[in-house]
């Protein structure tokens, strides 16, 4: 498994304003997925989201969450795509091990499994958001 | 039965410009493909110009060549995709293709569907 | 970017064994589609993501490949099958791009 460069921990309103970009894009995704019609959501697939042991903005799962972004654009040619990655990668803070996700074989299957991450990832994103800004007012109180 | 009809071919002087357009029929644009614009020069092989896709951005990719002189836009209420040209030299002589691609495993093959041309050509 | 497709062209007999290569610059990750052009008309869709055969398109016809290496091959040559063949890349993303192979004109031997 491929591990990924070490980067200097961001400020966390560099954080912000990355999560707040990632936010913004994750809805475009899914509006265009979600365009697609007779595909249903599959409970077979879950995207790590937040981590309970860590601190925002350390808590977002970023190398998963881009391993599984990766795995969608060997479907899926959006250019969105491309851009989630880039940011996603600005959030990968030290080494850390690439997961490995099997793509699907069926056809059928590969739009739950876009469907159904991109669902997570937009959910995710807002999670991710909501952590950093209660993490900052606590941060100030 | 779904098609793309191109239109706005014809000659032109060299420098002048022209504006091509791809009407789609028999389906409506909506996301998860691209739509370009692909051309070929008399007895020559098929080149890329610029491609757009339909959803929730307009994003554009262009052949280095075509950027200043090439724009590429839509309008989803006509299910329409346009092409300006500008600048026009005699090796832009070609039939113009518009072409719909696409953005992965939707549809698979059902959205590789090509109009038959319109030839433009620049002569004074 | 770049697709280099070879032979630029190729005489050969009816109930010939024909491939055609496809070279891209970087990965493609197998977005790579595969066409028959004869005159006048506009491209005819034979492959797609690589190895896809196109609805419609003889089983004669496969194609194969990954990362930059790509092959379309025609096991048993029909006369209907005397064209120009391209190869192209269509991935939307930045990471890729756009293009065309450079085209194999295939006549009789």
């Known amino acids: 498994s491929h591990t990924l460069p070490v980067r200097l921990l961001r400020p966390s309103d560099d954080v912000q304003k990355i999560v707040e970009e990632l936010q913004s894009l994750s809805k475009m995704l899914l509006k265009d997925v979600e365009e697609e019609k007779g595909v249903l959501v599959s409970q077979n697939y879950t995207l790590p989201c937040l981590s309970p042991d860590a601190q925002p903005p350390n808590n977002i799962h970023s190398p998963a969450i881009r391993a599984y972004l990766k795995t969608i654009r060997q479907l899926d040619n959006k250019s969105v795509i491309d851009e989630i990655i880039e940011h996603l990668d600005k959030l990968i803070f030290q080494d850390a091990p690439e997961t490995n996700i099997s793509v699907p074989t069926d056809t059928h299957e590969c739009k739950r499994f876009i469907l159904t991450i991109s669902q997570q990832f937009s959910e995710c994103m807002d999670l991710a958001l909501k952590s950093l800004t209660s993490g900052a007012q606590q941060a100030t109180t | 039965q779904s098609q793309l009809v191109e239109s706005g071919g014809g000659l032109v002087q060299p420098g002048g410009s022209l504006r091509l357009s791809c009407a789609a029929s028999?389906?409506?644009?909506?996301?998860?493909?691209?739509i370009c614009w692909v051309r070929q020069a008399p007895g020559k092989g098929l080149e890329w110009i610029v491609c757009?896709?339909?959803?929730?951005?307009?994003?554009?990719y262009y052949a280095p060549w075509a950027k200043g002189r090439f724009t590429i836009s839509k309008d989803n209420s006509k299910n329409t995709v346009y092409l300006q040209m500008n600048s026009l030299r005699a090796e832009d002589t070609a039939v113009y293709f518009c072409?719909?691609?696409?953005?992965?495993?939707?549809?698979?093959?059902?959205?590789?569907?090509w109009g038959q041309g319109t030839l433009v050509t620049v002569s004074s | 970017f770049q697709l280099t497709q070879s032979p630029s062209s190729l005489s050969a007999s009816v109930g010939d064994r024909v491939t055609i290569t496809c070279q891209a610059s970087?990965?493609?990750?197998?977005?790579l589609a595969w066409y028959q052009q004869k005159p006048g008309k506009p491209p005819k869709l034979l492959i797609y993501?690589?190895?896809k055969l196109a609805s419609g398109v003889p089983s004669r016809f496969s194609g194969s490949g990954s990362g930059t290496d790509y092959t379309l091959t025609i096991s048993s040559l029909q006369p209907e099958d005397f064209a120009t063949y391209y190869c192209?890349?269509?991935?939307?993303?930045?990471?890729?791009?756009w293009g065309f192979g450079t085209g194999t004109k295939v006549t009789v031997l």
């Open positions: 072409a719909r691609f696409s953005s992965g495993i939707y549809d698979l093959d059902r959205f590789f569907l």
């Open positions: 028999g389906f409506s644009f909506s996301a998860n493909y691209w």
């Open positions: 757009i896709y339909i959803g929730s951005r307009a994003d554009t």
């Open positions: 970087q990965s493609i990750e197998s977005w």
């Open positions: 993501q690589a190895s």
């Open positions: 192209q890349t269509y991935y939307g993303g930045g990471h890729i791009g």
